[in-house]
């Protein structure tokens, strides 16, 4: 059971425009959809192709797309087939054609006073309407002695006279659009007294200071007059020449000669012939000065051997159009072969290394010659001068890995570390010759390195393993000043690494031995219970066979860690009163007190008249204001440790006593009353 959800529908279409015949199918199993045109399968082309199950037209063609389309769905398993309704296009089109002589049979038979019929061969669907023109001017039906038959597309002149002479064209328009005649008809009905063209002047291009000749001849009975004009309607005769045409000569046969042409002579020259009767005939020709501009520069090109490449030479702007040719080593390239010129292109087929060099594009016209060189390099695959070697690099020192290659053009070298591209930074530097420098070798630099050298022709690569020779060092170096809390357990760690695992031991700086309650366990100095005598200078010594020993000096201080004797309390003060925040700390060395208010340290030297910090550490704020509200932190510190405690200060308005309240009514919160 094949079901069509959408069937194609007949529709209007425009010649050359897009269209779509829709088809949508459902079925119990896989189906394939194809299209028929007048019963024959439709083959996909770029113009007309299946799009899903619909049929898409990139450009409707009135000849190839006329007929009946049908969408067919077929189940290849069951053989069931369903066909959609028929659909067709109503294609609208218009096509230009020439104006032709319908009557008489040939131009030779056209005589004055005979009937002349012209036909406009523009066709279309729907049928277009026609408009005729003589010398570009529209002719309307019923004008003097001519009739237009739109149905027949004919223009009839009866009788035809010299006044009907001219260039006849037609245009037609329909719902689809408009078209004008592709070829027009020149009707020439002789009147002996009318001037007729025998020789018309042609446009001329000349080089500066060369000469230019315009020919012009008319015939009539009696003979016609002939006059030359330049641009601004200035007449040119042998007796009166305009100042800028001093070197102009008009010959008896009507030709005009200009010698030593300059830029100001360029322009339109008009030759006017006037018979005894009839309109004047005006013929125009333009004198152009030859010119040639400079050529754009070529970028150097790099090609690979064996490939085919093209270099296009854009000719410079010029008049007349410059001719272009390619040369190599002073020899003009042929138009066929392996290295040859095709149009403006230089073609190199199956490129060889010997093709490298300078090729020159030449362009020339009457105004001169221009040339531009292009440097062509034929790339080669890099070859090794020195591959990277497996290396042992010392930690902390610069390390180098070579990658020396040669090729044309100069190869680019990139380095990879563990398959990751190395980007140059403060630690890695790639020299112009490809060598990699590791500025200060770290332990984790011990890994695989790979360098790749490339040109457009190809690349080569090699890898090397780096082993880092670790230096003997403390990891981490012990802090030079450390504090231990009196009467408590304490440990001072010391660890080190090197090429061989070092042994670590502690000793007092004065060389005396460690007391029995102090143990040295694999580099960790352990004090079971710190006494005042444990203070002093100690040395951690790390040593191994190949690298000797290193020492770290540590000064140990024994301290009583800080505790607060008095801590500030949450305090509420009336505005304008004095606030007291108490703080007292003890410890050894004796701690110093600092205060922090509203996230900034209160510098005792810059407190101003309202604030004061007492010797015992308490903070007084006189004449408190609302902006003094906030958290205040008492910080106690000595050379061994630091502790802090904080309390909020609230500044409130003093309540106005109500009559109902007695004088002894307490405030609604804990206050400092001063």
């Amino acid at each position: 059971a094949i079901v069509f959800i959408k069937q194609p529908s007949s529709q209007d279409a425009l010649q050359g425009r897009r269209a779509l015949l829709r088809c949508e199918v459902e079925a119990p199993g896989p189906v394939h959809v194809y299209w028929l045109l007048d019963g024959a399968p439709v083959q996909d082309t770029e113009r007309r192709f299946a799009q899903g199950s619909s049929l898409s037209f990139a450009a409707v063609d009135r000849l190839q797309d006329s007929g009946t389309f049908q969408c067919v769905a077929r189940d290849d398993v069951t053989g069931e087939e369903a066909r959609s309704a028929n659909a067709s296009f109503n294609i609208k089109w218009i096509e230009a054609g020439p104006v032709v002589l319908k009557h008489p049979a040939s131009e030779a038979e056209i005589q004055p006073q005979t009937q002349v019929t012209l036909r406009c061969h523009i066709d279309g669907h729907p049928r277009p309407t026609y408009q005729w023109f003589r010398d570009g001017t529209p002719l309307s039906d019923g004008q003097s002695n001519h009739t237009v038959s739109s149905k027949e597309r004919n223009l009839t002149l009866r009788p035809a006279g010299p006044e009907h002479s001219g260039l006849y064209s037609c245009c037609a328009h329909s719902a689809f659009g408009q078209a004008c005649s592709s070829q027009n008809f020149t009707l020439s009905i002789a009147d002996e007294s009318f001037a007729r063209v025998v020789l018309a002047p042609q446009d001329v291009v000349v080089a500066r200071y060369e000469e230019a000749m315009f020919h012009c001849q008319f015939s009539a009975q009696p003979p016609p007059s002939l006059q030359w004009l330049f641009e601004d309607e200035t007449p040119i005769t042998n007796r009166s020449r305009p100042p800028h045409l001093r070197r102009a000569t008009v010959f008896a046969n009507g030709s005009l000669l200009l010698t030593q042409v300059r830029p100001r002579n360029a322009g339109i020259y008009r030759c006017i012939g006037q018979g005894q009767r009839g309109p004047p005939i005006i013929l125009e020709a333009t004198l152009h000065l030859a010119e040639i501009e400079d050529m754009p520069l070529f970028e150097p090109r790099v090609f690979t051997a064996g490939s085919e490449e093209r270099v296009t030479c854009l000719p410079p702007k010029g008049l007349p159009e410059p001719s272009v040719w390619w040369e190599h080593a002073g020899v003009r390239l042929p138009t066929h072969g392996r290295v040859y010129q095709k149009g403006h292109e230089l073609v190199l087929a199956n490129i060889a290394e010997s093709d490298a060099g300078v090729y020159t594009c030449h362009a020339a016209n009457l105004a001169g010659q221009r040339r531009q060189d292009v440097n062509i390099t034929v790339a080669t695959v890099p070859s090794w001068l020195k591959k990277p070697q497996d290396s042992q690099l010392e930690e902390g020192k610069p390390g180098y890995l070579d990658c020396l290659t040669q090729a044309t053009p100069k190869p680019t070298v990139v380095w990879y570390r563990n398959q990751m591209l190395i980007s140059e930074d403060s630690r890695f530097e790639v020299f112009k010759n490809g060598t990699l420098r590791i500025n200060s070798v770290e332990v984790y630099d011990g890994t695989w390195y790979r360098c790749m050298s490339s040109t457009p022709a190809g690349s080569i690569e090699a890898q090397a393993r780096v082993q880092v020779l670790e230096k003997l060092k403390f990891t981490p170096p012990p802090q030079p000043q450390q504090c231990m809390e009196f009467d408590k357990e304490a440990t001072v760690p010391c660890s080190a690494t090197g090429r061989e695992k070092p042994t670590i031991k502690w000793e007092r700086a004065d060389g005396s031995s460690l007391p029995e309650w102090v143990t040295d366990n694999a580099g960790t100095l352990h004090f079971a219970r710190v006494t005042r005598d444990d203070a002093g200078n100690y040395t951690c010594i790390a040593s191994n066979g190949p690298q000797g020993q290193i020492r770290a000096h540590v000064q140990l201080t024994v301290a009583v860690f800080i505790t607060f004797k008095v801590e500030p309390e949450r305090t509420t003060v009336y505005q304008g009163h004095t606030a007291l925040l108490q703080c007292e700390a003890q410890g050894d060395p004796k701690p110093l007190i600092q205060w922090k208010g509203k996230d900034r340290i209160l510098d005792p030297t810059k407190l101003g008249p309202r604030m004061h910090i007492f010797q015992n550490g308490s903070l007084v704020i006189h004449d408190v204001a609302p902006e003094d509200s906030g958290r205040y932190t008492c910080i106690a510190g000595n050379s061994c440790n630091i502790k802090h405690t904080e309390a909020p200060l609230y500044v409130v308005d003093k309540p106005v006593p109500e009559e109902s309240e007695g004088p002894g009514s307490p405030p609604p919160y804990k206050m400092i009353q001063t």
Epitope: V3, I5, K6, R22, P28, G29
Partner: antibody, heavy 122, light 107 residues
């Protein structure tokens, strides 16, 4: 005689789930696309979604208002289409119809069920 | 999404009158348009498919025309049994969309 019978409607709380069924008979169900359409009381018709036939790999398409919450499926062996509704909202309250349409030969068919009411309310 | 604008939204006419409903699509939908009749408490019933084709069993007093974006539905002579809501529906593109409906009453 062609019949489409919806079932599974009822009252459910916002955020709850419900599964509607549409049992088909009297035509080749497996060769048709099945659509669900709903209609809130006193309002117009709103298309909910569609499942295509095997020929089109059972492709589904949904209205933006239900996408990600509703799922349409079918069982050709049972001639039944389903509408699984999750994360229900009060605005999903409506009569839900299942429907199928297309050309069989050159005749257009358009089948609708009688509808089933879904009420989403707390 | 393609918007379907149906007008008028309600219509009152006398028995025997010629009644016309229009439907405009926000983009070209070719002839992929259906017209439905729905009576209270019932499922919609197809009257016209593909813009102008009368469904089987539908009286010839109903007709449809149009293509592209503008469509018309006509009842040549209004009868009491024609009281219902009428909907246009496009199926050129998913999501399928309906007009907002035209409620038809008898004066």
């Amino acid at each position: 005689e062609v019949q489409l019978v919806e079932s599974g409607g009822g009252l459910v709380q916002p955020g709850g789930s419900l599964k509607l069924s549409c049992a088909a008979s009297g035509f080749t169900f497996s060769g048709c696309a099945m659509h669900w359409v709903r209609q809130a009381s006193g309002k117009g018709l709103e298309w909910v979604g569609r499942i295509r036939s095997k020929a089109n790999n059972y492709a589904t398409t949904y209205a933006a208002s239900v996408k990600g919450r509703f799922t349409i499926s079918r069982d050709d062996s049972k001639n039944t289409a389903y509408l699984q509704m999750n994360s229900l909202k009060t605005e999903d309250t409506a009569v839900y119809y299942c429907t199928s349409r297309g050309y069989s030969g050159f005749d257009w068919f358009d089948y609708w069920g009688q509808g089933t009411l879904v009420s989403v309310s707390s | 999404d393609i918007q379907m604008t149906q007008s008028p939204s309600s219509l009152s006419a006398s028995v025997g009158d010629r009644v016309t409903i229009t439907c405009r699509a926000s983009q070209d939908i070719s002839n992929y348009l259906n017209w439905y009749q729905q009576k209270p408490g019932k499922a919609p019933k197809l009257l016209i498919y593909d813009a102008s084709n009368l469904d089987k069993g539908v009286p010839s007093g109903f007709s449809g025309s149009g293509s592209g974006t503008d469509f018309t539905f006509t009842i040549s002579s209004l009868q009491p049994e024609h009281i219902a809501t009428y909907y246009c529906q496009q199926y050129d593109n998913l999501p399928i969309t309906f007009g907002q409906g035209t409620r038809l009453e008898i004066k």
